[in-house]
Interface confidence: low
């Protein structure tokens, strides 16, 4: 079964390397469990960046990575991935499956582009 | 750091049950994810045997659903093993493991020998 | 039951060369609404439990290195340079329907 995912398409992380952007899915189900997974795309190949689920009781995601955090609420996930780097500029996924109970619904987002620039040292200076 | 370990006797007679213990830290078996056993036979080939839902449903192979029971005990956080009336093709390294789909976390396994 | 049939069954190559392995499915595991298959592959070192390399048949697990590579539409693993520490049992697993079944393994060695 499927369902929509939607997430912004431009993110621009901030001068700390931290992008934040929002996962959303509908149609909303009443849903025990739900798997997010944060892939990152690179050509024809994805690779998981953090996974973790959600539950009634356990609204805060991502205690295993020490990069990713998130939150969820009814059918949104605030998603907030530190420690970027311009090498780490890309294409992220958001992917969203309903676990538990059956049926299995399944969706993937289009993407968010995030862009990181790294900043500029600071100039040494004489006091 | 989420670990899994895996204990029970290393020898069981035939026809009699087989008893194995998974004690999970760093998760709550009740917070989420299926609790699976796998076993490894001698010629390395690989059986999952079922699993328990975070939620207590449980799930077994139907190759093997008429002998085993899957079980928990979530005040100690830990979930369980019985296979009953073994005989030596049960003979393996029995491992616990979760999962979501794909087994993310496993337990380093315990050998069982079946034998008289 | 889904058959999950690998091969070869053990692999010689020397290091930095590539390996690959395949696994071929009795029937399709591709859901349509995932865009995916559901395959997962694992490798075991000698006297280890079994770790999970990549799931969804192309998706590398956190910190997997990058060397390892699997192939979403024809179910073939990878190994673009083995290394010495490659050495091991892969296997793969279906979990497109119950009951979730592994191939037979395939043994890599380095010559």
């Known amino acids: 079964e499927a369902i929509q995912v939607t997430q912004p398409s431009v993110v621009l992380a901030s001068s700390h390397g931290v992008a934040s952007f929002p996962c959303e899915y509908s149609p909303s189900h009443n849903t025990d469990e739900v798997r997010v997974t944060v892939l990152r795309q690179t050509n024809d190949q994805m690779t998981e960046v953090c996974a973790t689920t959600f539950t009634e009781k356990n609204t805060v995601g991502f205690l295993d990575y020490p990069f990713c955090s998130g939150t969820f609420n009814e059918s949104r996930v605030n998603l907030t991935i530190q420690g970027l780097r311009a090498v780490d500029t890309g294409l992220y996924l958001c992917k969203v499956e309903l676990m538990y109970p059956p049926p299995y619904f399944v969706g993937m987002g289009n993407g968010t582009q995030i862009y990181v620039i790294d900043p500029e040292p600071c100039p040494d200076s004489d006091f | 750091q989420i670990q899994l370990q895996e204990s029970g006797p290393g020898l069981v007679n035939p026809s009699q049950s087989l008893s194995l213990s998974c004690s999970v830290t760093g998760y709550s078996i009740t917070s989420g994810y299926g609790w699976n056993w796998i076993r490894q036979f001698p010629g390395q080939k690989v059986e999952w045997m079922g699993f328990?839902?975070?939620?207590?449903?449980?799930y077994y192979n139907p190759s093997i659903k008429s002998r085993i029971s899957i079980t928990r005990d979530t005040s100690k956080n830990q979930f369980f093993l019985q296979v009953n009336s073994v005989t030596t093709e049960d003979t393996a390294t029995y491992y616990c493991?979760?999962?979501?789909?794909?087994?993310?976390?496993w337990g380093q396994g315990t050998m069982v020998t079946v034998s008289s | 039951d889904i058959m999950m049939t690998q091969s070869p069954s053990s692999l010689s190559v020397s290091a930095g060369e590539k390996a690959t392995i395949s696994c071929k499915s009795s029937?399709?595991?591709?859901?349509?609404?995932?865009?995916?298959?559901?395959l997962n592959w694992y490798l075991q070192k000698p006297g280890q439990s079994p770790k999970l390399l990549i799931y969804y048949a192309s998706t590398r697990h956190t910190g997997v290195p990058d060397r390892f590579r699997g192939s979403g539409t024809d179910f073939t693993l990878t190994i673009s340079s083995v290394q010495d520490e490659d050495l091991a049992f892969y296997y793969c697993?279906?979990?497109?329907?119950?009951?979730?079944?592994f191939g037979a393994g395939t043994k890599v060695e380095i010559k």
């Open positions: 029937q399709s595991l591709f859901n349509s609404n995932a865009k995916t298959n559901y």
């Open positions: 328990i839902y975070y939620e207590g449903s449980t």
């Open positions: 493991a979760r999962q979501t789909g794909y087994f993310d976390y």
């Open positions: 697993q279906q979990w497109y329907d119950y009951p979730y079944t």
